[in-house]
């Protein structure tokens, strides 16, 4: 029980997607606010999004200063334009989220292929290894940077006249296929964390064939 | 269920070779890095290196950079480790482990007792 | 590489004790620690990785802390099953490193 007209906050939900992270929950208020708290499992109490009338608060500011710590969210309610109201036990009413662990549950973002470069019946596709949010001697690391061994991407490639996919795999993020000499080949990737057991995948690459901008040829 | 079953003991003289398997079974074998690690009687535990079973790609503990070798046969889910110029303080229970994501050894096998004595 | 130090090397508490066992690394590993668990002639096996996560199946007596460079472990009410030698390993950076171990026994 709490104070009349305010209610606690429910489904809280993690949105993550290559660590930038964003904390999600309903209902909608009516005559209510929240301000949303953070903390490790072993922290302290950090607040953020105070007051708001948002049903969302984005923390990528607090997980990425270390994605392998376990975090835990809350969402307090409070009356609109009474906040220092709180409920029967003396505190403001609030519900606690799942815990959270980036490093093992962010979503893999849709990589993107940098480029592709023929040479002869070799072809080196190259996917563009993506910054993160995630922060070490003031800089950004990128999806590499961060995951090290643990990613790998899957190249799905055909030639342009048929349906037949074949499969490549590479933990670096460059791939060196041989093709046959005169067809022209489509190519897909995938980013890929073998070792979990959520999220394991991202989602296909746009498909990038041979004869546009982003290819070169060479004999 | 997974498991990691190794080869039985092995008594080796000096300046010998030892080559100890580990059979992998219950998960996708090529999803996970290999590790092997050492505990010589009464003493801790020393990683010597692992292996990525998806391309055979090794990473070894400059310790034993020069006499070790991490192999791998995808077709049966195993991975060997090669130890060679034996000298008695190579005396120790070699484990295969199965690095989980992020760092740690999640799973491991039972060890190869390897006994270097002339 | 990284050294591990731990302490103490052995310790000896009664049924139902509150043990804790302290990991210090000579630089900071971040959360890069796991602890294990080692009955003797038997192989090791994990208890807490990310220096606070009960790993699958682990009763939640044993539980992690720390950050950087010192840690700790706890065994919250140990039970007879806990006699064992207890190691901690940082997997922050290659080579991977154990402390030297902790052995439990019981008063």
């Known amino acids: 029980s709490g104070t009349t007209n305010t209610v606690a906050a429910y489904n809280l939900t993690w949105k993550s997607t290559n660590f930038k992270t964003i904390l999600e929950w309903e209902p909608k208020p009516v005559n209510q606010v929240y301000t949303v708290q953070i903390s490790t499992k072993s922290g302290d109490w950090k607040s953020k999004c105070f007051y708001t009338t948002d049903t969302e608060c984005d923390l990528t500011d607090e997980i990425v200063k270390d994605v392998k710590q376990t975090y835990l969210a809350r969402v307090f309610s409070y009356p609109a334009g009474n906040v220092e109201s709180t409920g029967s036990a003396g505190e403001p009413l609030y519900e606690n989220s799942p815990e959270f662990t980036p490093y093992l549950e962010t979503n893999l973002g849709q990589p993107t292929i940098q480029s592709f470069e023929q040479v002869g019946t070799k072809v080196n596709v190259t996917v563009e290894d993506e910054r993160t949010l995630v922060r070490r001697n003031n800089t950004f690391l990128s999806l590499r940077d961060v995951f090290g061994k643990d990613l790998i991407y899957t190249l799905y490639y055909w030639k342009s006249s048929s349906s037949g996919k074949k499969t490549a795999k590479t933990n670096t993020n460059e791939f060196l296929i041989d093709v046959d000499k005169g067809e022209n080949y489509c190519f897909s990737v995938q980013a890929v964390i073998p070792s979990r057991t959520v999220n394991r995948k991202s989602t296909d690459s746009p498909v990038e064939c041979m004869g546009q901008e982003k290819g070169e040829f060479r004999e | 269920e997974v498991q990691l079953v190794q080869s039985g003991a092995e008594v080796k003289k000096p300046g010998a070779s030892v080559k100890v398997s580990c059979k992998a079974s219950?998960?996708?074998?090529?999803?996970?890095?290999m590790n092997w690690v050492r505990q010589a009687p009464g003493q801790g535990l020393e990683w010597m290196g692992e292996?990525?079973?998806?391309?055979?790609?090794?990473t070894y503990n400059q310790k034993f950079k020069a006499r070790v070798t991490m192999t791998v046969d995808q077709s049966t889910s195993t991975v060997y480790m090669e130890l060679s110029s034996l000298r008695s303080e190579d005396t120790a229970v070699y484990y295969c482990?199965?690095?989980?994501?992020?760092?740690?050894?999640?799973?491991w096998g039972q060890g190869t007792t390897v006994t270097v004595s002339s | 590489s990284i050294q591990m130090t731990q302490s103490p090397s052995s310790l000896s508490a009664s049924v139902g004790d509150r043990v804790t066992i302290t990991c210090k690394a000579s630089?900071?590993?971040?959360?890069?620690i796991a602890w294990y668990q080692q009955k003797p002639g038997k192989s090791p096996k994990l208890l807490i990785y990310?220096?606070?996560n009960r790993y699958t199946g682990v009763p939640s007596r044993f539980s992690g802390s720390g950050y950087g460079t010192d840690f700790t472990f706890t065994i919250s009410s140990l039970q007879p099953e806990d006699i064992a030698t207890y190691y901690c390993?940082?997997?922050?950076?290659?080579?991977?490193?154990f402390g030297g171990g902790t052995k439990v026994e019981i008063k």
């Open positions: 482990a199965r690095r989980e994501l992020g760092g740690p050894f999640g799973y």
């Open positions: 219950g998960y996708s074998f090529t999803g996970y890095y």
């Open positions: 292996i990525n079973p998806s391309t055979g790609g090794s």
């Open positions: 630089q900071s590993v971040s959360t890069g």
């Open positions: 990310f220096a606070s």
């Open positions: 390993q940082q997997d922050y950076s290659s080579p991977w490193t």
